[in-house]
Amino acid sequence: DAEFRHDSGYEVHHQKLVFFAEDVGSNKGAIIGLMVGGVVIA
């Protein structure tokens, strides 16, 4: 019998990506961040 093919594959998990910009004062510019699943990663 031939073997059945099993792929490594991956499951797709959907998460909300939220970009935000925060003004921290006229002299300090802005912070731009990326929030993934409630955690700021950039």
Partner: antibody, heavy 121, light 112 residues
Amino acid sequence: QVTLKESGPGILQSSQTLSLTCSFSGFSLSTSGMGVSWIRQPSGKGLEWLAHIYWDDDKRYNPSLKSRLTISKDTSRNQVFLKITSVDTADTATYYCARRRNGYDGGFAYWGQGTLVTVSA
Amino acid sequence: DVLMTQTPLSLPVSLGDQASISCRSSQSIVHSNGNTYLEWYLQKPGQSPKLLIYKVSNRFSGVPDRFSGSGSGTDFTLKISRVEAEDLGVYYCFQGSHVPLTFGAGTKLELK
């Protein structure tokens, strides 16, 4: 969530071609590793695996029926199809489509409700 | 084809009992990737089969821990530690290593 639903003719005559459709949602058959099988079950009897189609259009068939089976898919419409030629009364069964879990773990984790097909002599 | 032989075909139990179902494959179902694709399904009357166990001993999500799978090579067992009413139905073992994929004939778990 993942759902699958089979549809078919209900009743057909011996020697005709059976065409079945599996319409699904909650996943895409273009996703790497994804695959859907057709499985049938005559009333009161056991389960028989028929065919499987992979995300990349590779296919596997049950050798005992291979000459009569054709599995195909329409990725954009989220559908998988099965054709069985030259049916006879022995093909009377409930036909299920089922999705295997993605990756090396395996397991038919998601099944449709099944569609009953009766072949009359 | 890989023949999957289940015993017993009928298993009368009382609620609260332990139940054990055996499944033997006619050849090794260890895949070349190292995994053993032995699975167990439960089918209740009028319903589609439901996945209980994959890769011999792994419970699928939502499956109670009273279900356990064991075995290797060609001999496998499904155990239910304390049978509940919702466990009644037909249990199928299945191998997903070789084409054609094959099911056992089924074991009907029913009340005495």
